[in-house]
């Protein structure tokens, strides 16, 4: 039964298990064709060079291939994500192939013995795809496999082992122990595809990451930042999941890569963004919303091919359930002046106010300290397509850093009463929004008013497109 | 059409084996996983486990361990339970039923029971 | 473990009257959009028999009189108009992706 620390504890656990304990059961690998999107249909079973099945089965030869690859499980069944998926490519390609690779018997194992099997999966694949290859028109480009967790590994050793090149893989969150930092023929890697995509969903620094944390594609996609996922906390567990523990805030997060490639085939409409960064900080300071030389790419299914670069780490904000689409801004506010600030850090939230809808009141997550005299910029996201925006409305609370910087504001007060209050000076945000690329720039509403209190509030209006400023007299450092 | 027909009913002596079977007609037997569940006189329904009836490896639940075996002979497309050592509390009636392994594993055909009796 | 309290225990229903189980969920049987709660129907002697799947989906076959409704952890199986051949016990039970899949209790349903 789970350890008290769920998959991370029982992984752990598995990891340490003595061989002895591993079942005898007869290797595996069944090639199931979805023939119907009922799921409890139960398919045609592929057998590699008998060719009745193909017929039998419909199997399209021009069509394309989808070959859906699980993971490492505990217990033995088929998942209801997996469903889920079929569903969804049948939906999205009417004409598509959709196979489901079976290895369970070999899955159903200590996790290491599991890990052991994956390149023996992934060679049954490949001798299948060879098989097909040699049939008329069938086009191994037009191959897509689509690996989950353990899975996308065995999707790289079957690119890896087949004979020529598939069209492309797609890794939803890898698995992480025993791939992390391996050799790239031993992993999932941008090698074993025309095109490697990959979402990271369940990945950290600290403790056991159930996903890889490392890049293995040519674009590797973090939402939110590739590990705590909204609506996977352990309150909205508890409330509206099964089991309601640990266990299940993993699956969630882990499962979480799978619910947004979903996502991607049947919300077509409302496609998500991701956005090329370096690392999740500068993502979340709100630095990284260029579309410029492929910086930014749908995600998921959608996701256009970039090979002219290797290991693209992609960032992006997401609801926590679909269709998972958000609206992201770059908002750049400059502080001109702080005025009897003491060691207050403040601590910014907006509303935004556009053509369609209106924002909630927004916190700006701060990153680092926000700078006085600077620029200082920031990431924020909508649920909502507001349209084009018209206002902002901004206010400031201050975030003492310590107890004792509170302290020192309180016996400061006490001392001086008079003291005039602490204030901010701002004449002006400039946004970009990541969905559209466009820039806007909000003057405050009164010029000759732009210092703003604690719990005041101040209203900035679209005063221009772009951000260039002219006849512009500032006494600081200006944007470029 | 679609059956599970099961074993008759057997009388046995605590501390026997007893072993019941369940074979499958009306479609392919290793496309389907097998449960079973056992129904104690006047009681409700309580899941035992099931087999993948294609790699032959078997699930229990926590109260079902150790005693008791699930097996297979795929040729015979039939599943066995067998209950080692039997107890007076394994009277009961027991039913082999099937779920599909790609949708949302309801059980949608059952074996019609066989009711095992402990003789004193 | 998942465990489902069903309620009443027994009830008595006149011919073309409306039915009402219960059965509750000691946790959420949800799963991205759907609920994973079926319903069973027993008559003494016979095995049981599939009447809904997924809260509310009807197994082909079984008439339109039985309908389920539900998510999270409170699910409903009604019969109407209640007809003779409905005296039976029904259960509930959760099938979501970690056995063990555990069945309620029972309620057992007597015609007037």
């Known amino acids: 039964s789970p350890t008290p620390f769920g998959p991370e504890g029982q992984l752990a656990d598995e990891l340490h298990k003595p061989k002895a304990i591993q079942t005898e059961v007869k290797p595996s690998v069944r090639f199931n064709l979805r023939t119907s999107k009922d799921p409890e249909h139960e398919g045609c079973y592929l057998s590699l060079g008998h060719s009745q099945p193909l017929e039998d089965c419909g199997f399209n030869m021009t069509a394309k291939t989808f070959f859906i690859i699980h993971g490492w499980t505990m217990s033995g069944i088929f998942e209801n994500w997996l469903h889920k998926l079929v569903s969804a490519l049948h939906t999205r390609e009417k004409d598509a192939n959709v196979v489901v690779v079976d290895w369970l018997p070999l899955a159903h194992q200590l996790y290491t013995d599991a890990v052991n099997n994956t390149r023996v999966v992934g060679h049954s694949i490949a001798r299948m795809l060879d098989w097909l290859q040699e049939k008329d028109d069938f086009s191994l480009g037009n191959v897509h496999l689509i690996g989950y967790s353990l899975g996308a590994h065995v999707a790289g050793y079957a690119g890896n082992f087949v004979k020529g090149t598939v069209g492309r893989i797609t890794g939803l969150d890898p698995a992480g122990p025993m791939f992390e930092g391996a050799d790239i023929h031993k992993r999932l890697s941008p090698d074993d595809a025309d095109f490697v995509d990959v979402l990271h969903t369940y990945t950290r620094s600290f403790g056991l990451s159930i996903g890889i944390q490392m890049p293995v594609g040519h674009i590797d996609i973090y939402p939110n930042g590739g590990d705590f996922q909204p609506g996977c906390g352990l309150n909205d567990v508890l409330g509206s999941m099964a089991y309601g523990t640990i266990t299940e805030v993993v699956k969630c997060e882990h499962e979480r890569a799978v619910h947004l490639f979903v996502d991607s085939l049947v919300n077509q409409d409302k496609p998500s963004f991701a956005f090329q960064c370096t690392d999740s900080n500068r993502f979340k300071k709100g630095i990284c919303l260029s579309c410029r030389k492929n910086r930014c790419n749908s995600i998921g299914y959608n996701a256009k091919k970039m090979r002219n670069k290797r290991n693209s780490k992609m960032y992006l904000k997401t609801r926590a359930g679909m269709p998972f689409r958000v609206y992201h801004y770059q908002m750049k506010i400059h502080v001109f002046s702080y005025k009897n600030m003491g060691e207050i850090e403040p601590t910014f939230y907006v509303t935004l106010y556009g053509t369609n809808a209106d924002s909630q009141t927004l916190p700006l997550e701060i990153v680092e300290r926000i700078e006085q005299n600077a620029t200082n910029t920031f990431l924020v996201y909508t649920e909502e397509d507001l349209g084009d925006l018209l206002k902002i409305q901004l206010t400031w609370e201050g975030a003492s850093q310590s107890w004792y910087n509170l302290w020192k504001e309180l016996r400061s007060y006490l001392s001086q009463p008079h003291n005039p209050g602490r204030e901010l000076n701002i004449r002006r945000i400039r946004v970009k929004s990541g969905e559209t690329q466009r820039k806007l720039t909000f003057c405050a509403e009164d010029p000759e008013n732009t210092s703003i209190s604690p719990g005041r509030e101040l209203w900035f209006r679209k005063c221009r497109d772009g951000w260039r400023m002219k006849n512009e007299t500032s006494p600081t450092v200006e944007l470029p | 059409q679609i059956q599970l027909v099961q074993s008759g009913p057997e009388l046995k002596k605590p501390g026997e084996t007893v072993k019941i079977s369940c074979k499958a007609s009306?479609?392919?037997?290793?496309?389907?996983?097998m449960n079973w569940v056992k129904q104690a006189p006047g009681k409700g329904l309580k899941w035992m486990g099931w087999i993948n009836t294609y790699s032959g490896v078997p699930t229990y639940a926590d109260d079902f361990k150790g005693r008791f075996a699930f097996s297979l002979e795929t040729s015979a497309s039939t599943a066995y339970l067998q209950i080692n050592n039997f107890k007076n509390e394994d009277t009961a009636t027991y039913f082999c039923a099937r779920f599909s392994y790609y949708g949302r594993h309801y059980f949608d055909y059952w074996g019609q029971g066989t009711a095992l009796t402990a003789s004193s | 473990d998942i465990v489902l309290t069903q309620s009443p225990a027994s009830l008595a229903v006149s011919l073309g009257q409306r039915a009402t189980i219960s059965c509750k969920a000691s946790?959420?049987?949800?799963?991205?959009?759907?609920?994973?709660m079926n319903w069973y129907q027993q008559k003494p002697g016979q095995p049981p028999k599939l009447l809904i799947y997924a809260a509310s989906n009807l197994k082909s076959g079984i008439p339109a009189r039985f309908s389920g409704s539900g998510s999270g952890t409170d699910f409903t199986l009604n019969i109407h108009p209640v007809e003779e051949e409905d005296a039976a016990t029904y259960y509930c039970q959760q099938t979501t992706d970690d056995p063990p899949w555990t069945f309620g209790g029972g309620t057992k349903l007597e015609i007037k």
């Open positions: 009306g479609y392919t037997f290793t496309n389907y996983g």
């Open positions: 946790q959420s049987v949800d799963y991205d959009g759907d609920s994973y």
